[in-house]
């Protein structure tokens, strides 16, 4: 079951660069975190598209914490239609891209998807089925998505994570929103579609936030986040509607939608890894 | 029966390296149906998982956050033992270190089902 | 990282009691969870794994329930020997985490 005259090179994570310009965590709501302490602290509101003041606690808490509201708005807000383009191009991989493959120690033989930093290209790995890192995508496809370079050598992708039910891995998910167009609608409409933890097979709808449209998934009974639709039409009317779309020369057209105050269940949160 | 002995050093100076090594027997450190790990305990910090490797055709291994700029866990297949290294320690890694051997892999319930018996390292000057 | 967190901290009982103690995850883990003993100077010991499941050896008045964020160890019938402290790990995530122990006291 060994092979002893293995050579003991060690696959490990390599030095990550940080990313830069809009970030899938500019999302999250505000968390003040468990401690007590009194900090003035910035986070990005997704209802009112401004960086805003918050107090947070001192310790946990989420990434859309910023010390400065200079900073906030450099990690999250948009200029106008151009910088959006500019943004959107110049965009770099996430994190997890640079991550090493990891099968993580379990022994199931799930065929995933890597980048590979050397290479420059996603590639097939056998996943455990347990632990692992977030480099780590069921299509060949989504990781070509998230983490190899377009064909002007930009990347084009936001991101977001989630934990996958099936296997308990942590797992990226894109949560792109198509060029053409600014979400303000419920922040979860941005969230990955995720199935939760339970054995079930329901039949639910989520909002697809690269492609702009509700699609279909199984959802197992339990846990899962606020992206999660009995029907189609509920799916659209309380997602679709939150997008403004973008004409190409830079005017905007907005959609009619009603501004209705929801709240975020702690659910939605947890999706998202908190320290990558 | 699995064994996990382990062997280092009680006291380390202040941004010197931590150095255990834990002896295998009764399994492979290369076996691919198991990982191996370390683990500290303080007071202060309570049970915090470091790292793990494990070979699956090859070396893999996996760091916590917290120490994965300092520290490095080496296999060495020909004493059937691994090593745990932490570099520039300071007072505050100071705890009771023990290695530990992931069990359950096949089954994907896993969990730590042997352990060796905790080496106290002192960090102080 | 997915935080555990036990109650209570310590509680005192007497031989022959029913002990239970809790486990909270900051996150839904499923079943991911196992229970360990630690005895003074000694390393943790497995005592459940997978939330419910017995490891060999381990004596079953030993049980574990729960499923999500919420999970229990009970002791049906408390023993000299049990007197120690208990702890609850989650591996639905990467890294595995530690509760901070629950402490058996004799009353």
């Known amino acids: 079951d060994s092979e002893e005259d293995e050579e003991h090179t060690i696959i490990t994570d390599t030095e990550l660069p940080p990313l830069k310009l809009m970030h899938s965590f500019c999302a999250f709501k505000a968390d003040d975190g468990p401690c007590k302490a009194i900090m003035k602290r910035f986070f990005f509101n997704i209802f009112t598209r401004q960086c805003e003041e918050f107090i947070y606690g001192g310790c946990e808490g989420n990434q859309n914490r910023f010390e400065s509201l200079e900073e906030c708005k450099k990690m999250c807000t948009r200029d106008n239609a151009n910088r959006i383009i500019k943004t959107t191009l110049q965009q770099e991989k996430p994190d997890f891209c640079f991550l090493e493959e990891d099968p993580g120690i379990c022994r199931g033989y799930i065929t995933r998807y890597f980048y590979n930093n050397q290479t420059k290209q996603c590639e097939r790995f056998k996943y455990g089925g347990c632990l692992g890192n977030m480099n780590n995508f069921e299509t060949l496809e989504e990781c070509k998505n998230i983490c190899e370079d377009g064909p002007n050598g930009f990347q084009v992708d936001n991101y977001g994570t989630q934990l996958n039910a099936v296997n308990n891995s942590l797992t990226p998910q894109s949560t792109k929103v198509p060029s053409l167009f600014e979400f303000h609608g419920p922040s979860w409409c941005l969230t990955p579609a995720d199935r939760g933890l339970c054995r079930a097979n329901e039949n639910r709808f989520y909002y697809n936030s690269v492609i702009g449209k509700c699609r279909p998934f199984k959802y197992s009974g339990c846990g899962g986040n606020e992206n999660n639709f009995t029907s189609k039409q509920e799916c659209l009317r309380a997602c679709k509607k939150g997008f403004i779309q973008r004409i190409s020369k830079g005017g905007l057209i907005k959609t009619k939608r009603k501004r209705k105050k929801q709240r975020v269940k702690i659910a939605y949160e947890e999706i998202f890894v908190k320290n990558m | 029966q699995v064994q996990l002995q382990q062997s280092g050093p009680g006291l380390v100076k202040p941004s010197q390296t931590l150095s255990l090594t834990c002896a295998i027997s009764?399994?492979?450190?290369?076996?691919?149906?198991?990982?191996w790990g370390w683990i500290r305990q303080s007071p202060g910090r309570g049970l915090e998982w470091l790292g793990h490797?494990?070979?699956?055709?090859?070396?893999?291994?996996s760091y916590a956050v917290s120490v994965k700029s300092r520290i490095t866990i080496n296999p060495d297949t020909s004493k059937n033992q691994f090593s745990l290294q932490l570099n520039s320690v300071t007072p505050e890694d100071t705890a009771v270190y023990y290695c530990a051997r992931w069990g359950g892999i096949h089954d994907g319930d896993i969990y730590f089902d042997y352990w060796g018996q905790g080496t106290l390292v002192t960090v102080s000057s | 990282d997915i935080q555990m967190t036990q109650s209570p901290s310590s509680l005192s009982a007497s031989v022959g009691d029913r002990v239970t103690i809790t486990c909270r995850a900051s996150q839904n883990i499923s079943n991911y969870l196992n229970w360990y003993q630690q005895k003074p100077g000694k390393a943790p010991k497995l005592l459940i794994y997978?939330?419910?499941s017995l490891q060999s050896g381990v004596p079953s008045r030993f049980s574990g329930s729960g499923s999500g964020t919420d999970f229990t160890l009970t002791i049906s019938s408390l023993q000299p020997e049990d007197f120690a402290v208990y702890y609850c790990?989650?591996?639905?995530?990467?890294?595995?985490?530690f509760g901070q122990g629950t402490k058996v006291e004799i009353k």
């Open positions: 997978g939330t419910s």
């Open positions: 009764g399994d492979s450190v290369s076996s691919n149906g198991a990982a």
């Open positions: 790990q989650q591996y639905g995530n990467n890294p595995t985490t």
């Open positions: 490797i494990y070979y699956r055709s090859k070396w893999y291994n």
